[in-house]
Structure formats: C-alpha cells, structure tokens
Amino acid sequence: LIIGFGISGRHSITVTTVASAGNIGEDGILSCTFEPDIKLSDIVIQWLKEGVLGLVHEFKEGKDELSEQDEMFRGRTAVFADQVIVGNASLRLKNVQLTDAGTYKCYIITSKGKGNANLEYKTGAFSMPEVNVDYNASSETLRCEAPRWFPQPTVVWASQVDQGANFSEVSNTSFELNSENVTMKVVSVLYNVTINNTYSCMIENDIAKATGDIKVTESEIKRRSHLQLLNSKAS
C-alpha cells in the first residue's frame, strides 16, 4: 500500500492500485481506488504513464477532460464515471497494445486531499487451452491447443497417476505465429496416454498460467480449463 503525503496544507488520501496484465487486442482494466468524496465535482483523476509526455486520461468536474491526452491513448480510455463517487478511479483501456506495458500513476485530488499510487502494467497474450483426444489405430494421444500467447510460454504435461513424471520425452510442442505476427498458437501433443487417468497441460509465461485438464476413461472424457494472471500485487 502506498500512501501519498499531503503538500502545502492539504491532507493525504489513500490511493490503492493493483498490478495487472492486459491481453493484446482485448480491453484491459488498470485498477485504482481511493477514499471517496461526497461531491463528484471536487474529484480529479489523472492517469499518467512513465515516459509519456501527455496524460493517459483525465477526469474532472464529473466528466472526461482529454485536451492534454497523449496521442497513443486517443479514443482508447474511459473511467467508470458512475463509480467515481464511490472511490473507483479504475481505467478501462481498449484494444490493449504491446507498447501499453509500463509504469502508470493514478493521481487523485479530492476535497479531502491528494494522493497517488503507481501500477505496473504488463502486456502480452494468454488464452485458455483446450485438451482433446486424438485416436491412432490402437492408441490415443492428447492434443492441447491454445490460440494466443505472448511472450512464448513453456508447456508442461502432468498426470494424476504418474505424479512427478517428466513427460518431455513423450510430448511435442510447437508454436505457430498468428496472422498479426505477434501472438502465437500453442499446440502440444502427448503420446503414450493411458486410460483411467487425468492429464494436465500447463501453459505459462511471465504474465499468465493456464491449465487444461482432461480425465480419460473408457466411457467418458471430462475436460476443465482455468487461467490465472500472475503477479497481481496491490500497491
């Protein structure tokens, strides 16, 4: 938690941010909360980015004030105007770009005082894996596919029955560049699959970790996937 101390007689207010990650091409949220004020017209929100001359976004007197907004953020930012009064200064960032990564400052002025907090924003690509069974003449393989990752992740297979086993010798992973030439499709194939077992395909980079599980029996196949963003730290 970072508390900004007051200058020239004004009190400080507590501003809290959470480090987060944006998925390239999708919309992202830069989280920031502050001690609320009773009057919307007394609240000023400024978002700044280290190394960028113009503002990322400014909200004051109950509306956006974008005259000093930097070109790289033009038309891509918005605050949740109806939630500002309750202390939500989070910024919605549309169509996240790789270059949006960096250190952001959420700077707040209210009638109670002012405060700020920094936020580390990472950008990349991450997606849910899907694990399917492929059939050969008399054996099965598992195919784990995830459409969009960046930077290039690691892929590790695990199994419930053979806990701690290393499947690198019986698996093959490939990365195929997508059409926008940044993100990549991840495909990993696991050979020598045995029935009555649950396998996990774990894909991880420095931004996210995703797991696709598949339970394989004679009579059914059950799948489950989940994705977790890494390094979500509060400041």
């Epitope: 399917n132 099965e140 004679e218």
Partner: antibody, heavy 117, light 106 residues
C-alpha cells in the same frame, strides 16, 4: 489390422433367441470394450449395449430385460444374446470396438437377422 | 435419451460441389459428436470425432464443426465415392444416432 468378424444365424422364429459371436483381431479385449448396435429401416441405428474391457456391462434400458453380453478374452470373442425376439427385431446387428470416451470406431461386417415364422 | 435430429433426409449434389449436412442434439453435448459414412451393403465408417477432428485416413475434404446442440458435416469438392448415407451420433452418454442423410447425384 483391426478386425471384428461376426457369426450368427440369419433367420430366427418369433419368441426364440438370437446368439451372435464377434471374434476380434488386431487388438485385445482386455484393453478395449465392444458395443452392439443394430440397424433397421424403421428405427435407424440403435445402441443396444456394451461390454467394457474390465468385463462390466451397460445396456440400453429398452433391452435390459432380454439382452446379455459376455466375452472370452483368451479366445478374443464377445457373445451377444437377445431373448424373446419379435418381428420388429429384424435388423442388421453390429459389434463395434470402443475407444476412449465411448467412441465407436471399427465396426464388424454385420449380422442380418430376420425374425419370421 | 438425447435425440439427434438430421432434418435433411436426402441431399442432391454434383461432383465437385460443396455440401453441408446438419445435425441437432436435443440437449447440450459439448463437442462429443461423431459422423459416420455408410455405403450400401457396408458397415458404417467413422469420419469425424469430437465434432471436428478427422479420424485416421479420412480425406481433408471432410470437415466437421459445431458444439453444444448444432453440428455440421461439410464435404468440399464432392467425389462420386462420397455418395452414401451420413449419420451423426452423440457419445457423451449412451450413444444415440441421427436418422441419416442420403447424399445422391442430381
């Protein structure tokens, strides 16, 4: 090469029973289940039942009272028996290999059954 | 039981055409759907499993798609040897089949 070969009678009288043997090659019944499916012009393809690799069975609820499936792993044979046959049991009966997740992949050549007096 | 409905009983086509056969499940079956081809006097032959994955040796002109309740089998550049009956089947529970679609020449 995976093969399922069926043998059984072509004509059975009403109220009698049907017995079909499915002899498999190219895979072991210790590792694969075998389904039974029938096909008739009136009802299309109908799943009848399955014997799993471990020997347990599942049956279509419509046939559970008159159907039994068993196997002899050492002879690579699966046995199908259906009792109390009626004219509407006239169909082609197939044995089919099971794959992981209940997928039916390799089919026998079929046994054509006519139930008639 | 889950009912698989193939509304097209017969589809007429010409060699080289593209044809799409549809199948609807009475409830959500995820992608646990297979497609079979059956020629007269022969046993059904597995073409597609998991709704969209081609089985071993199946030509790439056969494509499956769909999930949930709506599924399609598309045959691109139809060949004379493709004239047959096509059945969809769900195997998320005890298997049930569609009534079939016969592909014939115009």
């Amino acid at each position: 090469q995976v093969q399922l070969k069926q043998s059984g009678p072509g004509l059975v009288q009403p109220s009698q029973s049907l017995s079909i043997t499915c002899t498999v090659s190219g895979f072991s019944l210790a590792n694969f289940g075998v389904h039974w499916v029938r096909q008739s012009p009136g009802k299309g393809l109908e799943w009848l039942g399955v014997i799993w690799s471990g020997g347990s069975t599942d049956y279509n609820a419509l046939f559970i009272s008159r159907l039994s499936i068993s196997k002899d792993i050492s002879k690579s044979q699966v046995f199908f028996k259906m009792n109390s046959l009626q004219a509407d049991d006239t169909a082609i009966y197939y044995c089919v290999r099971n794959r992981v997740g209940r997928l039916l992949d390799s089919w026998g050549q079929g046994t054509t059954l006519t139930v008639s007096s | 039981d889950i009912v698989m409905t193939q509304s097209q009983k017969v589809m007429s086509t010409t060699v080289g055409d593209r044809v799409t056969i549809t199948c609807k499940a009475s409830q959500n079956v995820d992608t646990v759907v297979a497609w079979y081809q059956q020629k007269p006097g022969q046993s059904p032959k597995l073409l597609i499993h998991s709704a969209s994955r081609r089985y071993i040796g199946v030509p790439d002109r056969f494509t499956g798609s769909g999930s949930g309740t709506d599924f399609t089998l598309t045959i691109n550049n139809v060949q004379s040897e493709d004239l047959a009956d096509y059945f969809c089947q769900q195997y998320s529970t005890n298997p049930t089949f569609g009534a079939g679609t016969m592909l014939e020449l115009k």
